[in-house]
């Protein structure tokens, strides 16, 4: 089912010259990253 598709997609992404670390970096919170610069930028 859906779980199998997700697993396959994840496995394929790893095969496309990606590492788990690079995937986690991509998922890094934009909110956390913004803390390293002008924190109020883009805030409401």
């Amino acid at each position: 089912g859906g779980g199998g598709s997700k697993h396959k997609c994840f496995r394929n992404s790893l095969e496309n010259n990606e590492t788990l670390e690079s995937i986690m970096n991509t998922l890094e919170s934009e909110e956390d990253f913004r803390k390293y610069f002008y924190y109020l930028e883009g805030s409401k």
């Epitope: 991509t26 934009e30 956390d32 803390k35 390293y36 610069f37 002008y38 109020l40 930028e41």
Partner: antibody, heavy 118, light 112 residues
Framework: QVQVVESGGGVVQPGRSLRLSCAAS????????MHWVRQAPGKGLEWVTV????????NYADSVKGRFTISRDNSKNTLYLQMNSLRAEDTAMYYC???????????WGQGTMVTVSS | DIVMTQTPLSSPVTLGQPASISCRSS???????????LSWLQQRPGQPPRLLIY???NRFSGVPDRFSGSGAGTDFTLKISRVEADDVGVYYC?????????FGPGTKVDIK
């Protein structure tokens, strides 16, 4: 006016420690991430470390990880860099830079020189 | 780490003439928020670096409109439309898309 001023540099022997300071003025220090960047004599720029606006998040270049510690005191508008186990290759001008809008380093200090030599 | 390269490394220019510096990154600088965090810095002799351009093409406050930035993805350019004596120095591109933040090796601009 908006500025940052570094201090604390000097000549130190290999293996010893040094603490740099960066005094900020003219802006709300506690709203900005702050960075240290260094430049060895006659060489290019190297990013060293960053601390988030509130001090909760830090990141370091591999070359200084485990030896350097960045910290800040928002009540004093001051950024610090504690440098331990110093090596000859740490010899450089150390600049404090503000992480500004557009994820850019928009304000730079004049730098403080650190020389590691026996 | 993202490696930044610049060409040329040295650029002798004539006063009043244009100059162009190229910067290339080893991987795309487009962040997940859709922005590209590529900036250009100028370092005059004996001075600290100074921000010229951020997010590829945005001039920082006080920077003359003689300076312009362009590019996308992995290829970027800084152009000086008419070089003035004040422009002598080293120009660095820098990426703040991904840790560790990295700089290009610098391009030295001087007058012929």
């Amino acid at each position: 006016q908006v500025q940052v001023v570094e201090s604390g540099g000097g000549v130190v022997q290999p293996g010893r420690s040094l603490r740099l300071s960066c005094a900020a003025s003219g802006f709300t220090f506690s709203n900005y991430g702050m960075h240290w960047v260094r430049q060895a004599p006659g060489k290019g720029l190297e990013w060293v470390t960053v601390i988030s606006y509130d001090g909760s998040n830090k990141n370091y270049a591999d070359s200084v990880k485990g030896r350097f510690t960045i910290s800040r005191d928002n009540s004093k508008n001051t950024l610090y860099l504690q440098m331990n186990s110093l090596r000859a290759e740490d010899t450089a001008m150390y600049y404090c830079a503000r992480g500004g809008s557009g994820f850019a380093f928009d304000i730079w200090g004049q730098g403080t020189m650190v020389t590691v030599s026996s | 780490d993202i490696v930044m390269t610049q060409t040329p490394l040295s650029s002798p220019v004539t006063l009043g003439q244009p100059a162009s510096i190229s910067c290339r990154s080893s991987q795309s600088l487009v962040r997940s928020d859709g922005n590209t965090y590529l900036s250009w810095l100028q370092q005059r002799p004996g001075q600290p670096p100074r921000l010229l351009i951020y997010k590829i093409s945005n001039r920082f406050s006080g920077v003359p409109d003689r300076f312009s930035g362009s590019g996308a993805g992995t290829d970027f350019t800084l152009k000086i439309s008419r070089v003035e004596a004040d422009d002598v120095g080293v120009y660095y591109c820098m990426q703040t898309t991904q840790f560790p933040f990295t700089f290009g090796p610098g391009t030295k601009v001087d007058i012929k």
